[in-house]
Interface confidence: low
């Protein structure tokens, strides 16, 4: 019996087609992805093949103005229109709190939403009961397939699930649910979830009875053969893991942002064992036309976005200096504003010992692309912020050793004075440079804000200590020459859309007046 699994993950609000790098579509003839194009391909496959499942492995939420405005209603509407068969909860589905998941998505979705390792307690338990499930048995042709869900247990540090949801260890939580499916005579089981490729492989290895793992969170691109675009494969598609009980378990992920549709064909024997698996992600490029009815629907929903982008989010009573003359040479107040917003967005008081789990932010000055003039009545709009942060990136959480941070700050000024983008703006960090010293030895003082303290204060950076830092995904991926971050990071979790972080902060503060306050000094 043959099953076709179509899968997406980490779509992050890319409902419209995007450019090749998943930013705003500039030249339509070269754009990719989007739900209208995805629907064309899915329908084509549904027409051609008998047993098809369309699955999503989480993180539909967060990433563009679509989510900012529609807050998840757009996800439910268009996933319903595409007739998804199941979805796993990702960490970003909790970005607007549990209410922001229940009302727009859980109550509106016409497909099961899954996670076996999230347990509700207290008053929430009855409120959320039945709205998401640990597993679901789906009829496919003449057979049944069990789908069991999972979500990153780091979600409390990455999003806003509140105090009434407990995120258990994935493997511990999955095993009893799979065992239950076996007792129900379900012998074809897919683990669908959002914990990253390393955990996907562990699940394939450790959870008895799981036949296929469809994952997300790490934006992993797998491909067999010559890759069709810029993404470099982390391994073959599917990635085969040998389980502890000797089975070959295919593991798949489909990069992110709706650029690809994962396409996996599995052949099962009559006892539900996987005999063979093969496939590849399908690049959703402009050779695949956008479905006209979905596209028309997108255009209808778009109108509200255009109105939103010119509305006032808040006010500034000072000039927000985002000029390259400032932000690439010295501390600039636009850099301070953005870093303060990044930290504010990551306030998670999850431990009495820590006032927060992260206190530091770094931001490449070259990523700040425009100032905002306070003389326009002080008004700040989404449109203004899109000029400051035009690349559609995310502000991510990483763990780094102090020694890596020191290297990053040396890199920040290694060719100072040429107006290059790697000059770092900061939050929760005090740095002093001596430019008379040779490159690689210019950081003379680097103090960082403590987290394990009731009164935050600045202490000297310790080379061997592991620190959490918020930074743009561009830096986490080694951009602007920060190869040491990419090579030495100990953990990397994708965060919220950059503009969304800053806009939320400005809306929350109402009036802002960031200053240049001595975070970066030259001796």
């Amino acid at each position: 019996w043959e099953l076709t699994i179509l899968h997406t993950n980490d779509v992050h609000s890319r409902l419209e087609q995007t450019s090749e790098d998943s930013s705003k579509c500039v030249n339509a003839s070269r754009c990719m992805g989007g739900v209208a194009r995805l629907f064309t391909k899915v329908q084509q496959i549904r027409r051609a093949e008998p047993n098809v499942l369309l699955l999503d492995a989480g993180d539909q939420y967060q990433g563009t103005i679509w989510f900012t405005v529609y807050k998840g209603a757009e996800v439910a509407h268009f996933m319903n229109a595409l007739r998804y068969d199941a979805m796993a909860l990702g960490n970003h589905e909790f970005d607007n709190g549990v209410e922001g998941l229940i009302e727009p998505l859980l109550k509106e979705a016409k497909f099961p939403i899954l996670s076996a390792n999230i347990k509700a307690k207290g008053p929430l338990a009855s409120q959320i009961s039945g709205l998401y499930l640990p597993y679901k048995v789906l009829p496919v042709g003449d057979e049944v397939v069990g789908i069991v869900g999972y979500t990153s247990k780091e979600t409390p540090f990455l999003s806003n699930p509140g105090t009434n949801l407990v995120f258990e260890d994935e493997i511990t939580a999955l095993q009893p649910e799979v065992d239950k499916l076996k007792t129900l005579n379900v012998n074809k089981i897919i683990a669908l979830g959002h914990s990253g490729f390393e955990m996907d492989k562990l699940i394939a290895q450790k959870v008895r009875g799981v036949d296929v793992v469809v994952g997300g969170h790490s934006n992993t691109f797998l491909y067999t053969g010559n890759p069709p675009s810029k993404e470099v494969p982390a391994g073959k598609y599917p990635f085969i893991v040998t389980s502890d009980d000797g089975r070959k378990v295919p593991v798949v992920q489909a990069y992110a942002f709706g650029k690809y549709l994962g396409y996996l064909k599995i052949e099962f024997d009559e006892r539900g064992n996987v005999i063979s698996s093969h496939g590849n992600p399908i690049l959703l490029n402009s050779s695949i036309p956008e479905d006209p009815s979905i596209k028309a629907d997108i255009n209808k929903w778009r109108i509200k976005l255009d109105n939103y982008s010119t509305q006032e989010l808040g006010k500034t009573i000072v000039y927000l200096d985002g000029s390259s003359q400032s932000c690439r040479f010295r501390e600039c107040n636009m850099g301070n504003l953005i870093c303060d917003a990044m930290i504010n967005n990551n306030l998670r008081h999850t431990d009495e010992m820590f006032w927060n789990h992260v206190s530091m932010c770094i931001l490449n000055g070259g990523g700040i692309r425009s100032p905002i003039d306070e003389r326009n009545n002080g008004t700040i709009t989404w449109e203004n912020l899109a000029a400051v942060l035009p690349f559609g990136g995310t502000f991510d959480l990483v763990q780094l050793k102090g020694s890596t941070l020191k290297k990053a700050f040396e890199h920040s000024v290694h060719r100072y004075g040429q107006s290059t983008g790697e000059f770092l703006q900061v939050g929760g960090i005090h740095v002093v440079y001596d430019l008379s010293r040779k490159p690689g030895d210019r950081v003379v003082k680097l103090d960082v804000l403590c987290t394990k303290c009731r009164v935050p204060s600045y202490d000297p950076l310790k080379m061997d200590e592991v620190y959490k830092v918020i930074l743009p995904n561009f830096l986490a991926n080694g951009g602007d020459g920060f190869q040491m971050i990419k090579d030495e990071l100990l953990r990397h979790d994708s965060g919220d859309q950059d503009i969304n972080v800053v806009s939320t902060y400005i809306s929350k503060m109402k009036v802002i007046y960031p200053a240049v306050e001595g975070r970066i000094k030259f001796s």
Partner: antibody
Framework: QVQMKQSGPELVKPGASVKIPCKAS????????MDWVKQSHGESLEWIGD????????IYNQKFKGKVTLTIDKSSSTAYMELRSLTSEDTAVYYC???????????WGQGTSVTVSS | DIQMTQSPSSMYASLGERVTITCKAS??????LSWFQQKPGKSPKTLIY???RLIDGVPSRFSGSGSGQDYSLTISSLEYEDMGIYYC?????????FGGGTKLELK
């Protein structure tokens, strides 16, 4: 539509100065930086510098420091480039070019020819 | 300053031919590269920025690619109006620097 309008050709004597205007239209003047580029006859292009119309901030190519001053007049949406102490080496066509959100030049003026001759 | 080495410096091609011009930077320029076309007596016209993003209104036969230090401009099927001089420009680091140009003529 976006346009940069430059003035006509200039014939100037050695040692004199010249101020070339570049009038922008079709977009919000303060939203984009303005770059200036030199092209000597039959040669490639040379980047002179860049001005931010929001705050008048400038970045110059070291090679043109002391030779060139970039200014703006927000009220007329005009950028200016002044060339001082002119010599025959300064004979060239000078272009202004708007930069887009990526700081890449996208729209160019038609160029102003400056000839330095006694 | 970053050196931009463009090649070839001149070339002849036939109508309908696929043409590729390359530009090599003396260091990584993070895809901050533009391509321009200039015709005699005219100002340059921007074709591509950010290495591969087409400016609105530029025909789709023009495409850009590359990363790091190596970049190229391709014309998929040459037309008569494509004759002229092509320049690359890096805008990653000040001072911005142009390539020496490639003169494209009809064979």
């Amino acid at each position: 539509q976006v346009q940069m309008k430059q003035s006509g050709p200039e014939l100037v004597k050695p040692g004199a100065s010249v101020k070339i205007p570049c009038k922008a239209s079709g977009y919000t003047f303060t939203d984009s930086n303005m770059d200036w580029v030199k092209q000597s006859h039959g040669e490639s292009l040379e980047w002179i510098g860049d001005i931010n119309p929001n705050n008048g901030g400038t970045i110059y190519n070291q090679k043109f420091k002391g030779k060139v001053t970039l200014t703006i007049d927000k009220s007329s949406s005009t950028a200016y480039m002044e060339l001082r102490s002119l010599t025959s080496e300064d004979t060239a066509v000078y272009y202004c070019a708007r930069t887009n959100w990526d700081y890449a030049m996208d729209y160019w003026g038609q160029g102003t020819s400056v000839t330095v001759s006694s | 300053d970053i050196q931009m080495t463009q090649s070839p410096s001149s070339m002849y091609a036939s109508l309908g031919e696929r043409v590729t011009i390359t530009c090599k930077a003396s260091q990584d320029i993070n895809s901050n590269l533009s391509w321009f076309q200039q015709k005699p007596g005219k100002s340059p016209k921007t074709l591509i920025y950010r290495a591969n993003r087409l400016i609105d209104g530029v025909p789709s036969r023009f495409s850009g690619s590359g990363s790091g230090q190596d970049y190229s401009l391709t014309i998929s099927s040459l037309e008569y109006e494509d004759m002229g001089i092509y320049y690359c420009l890096q805008y990653d680091v000040f001072p911005r620097t142009f390539g020496g140009g490639t003169k494209l003529e009809l064979k």
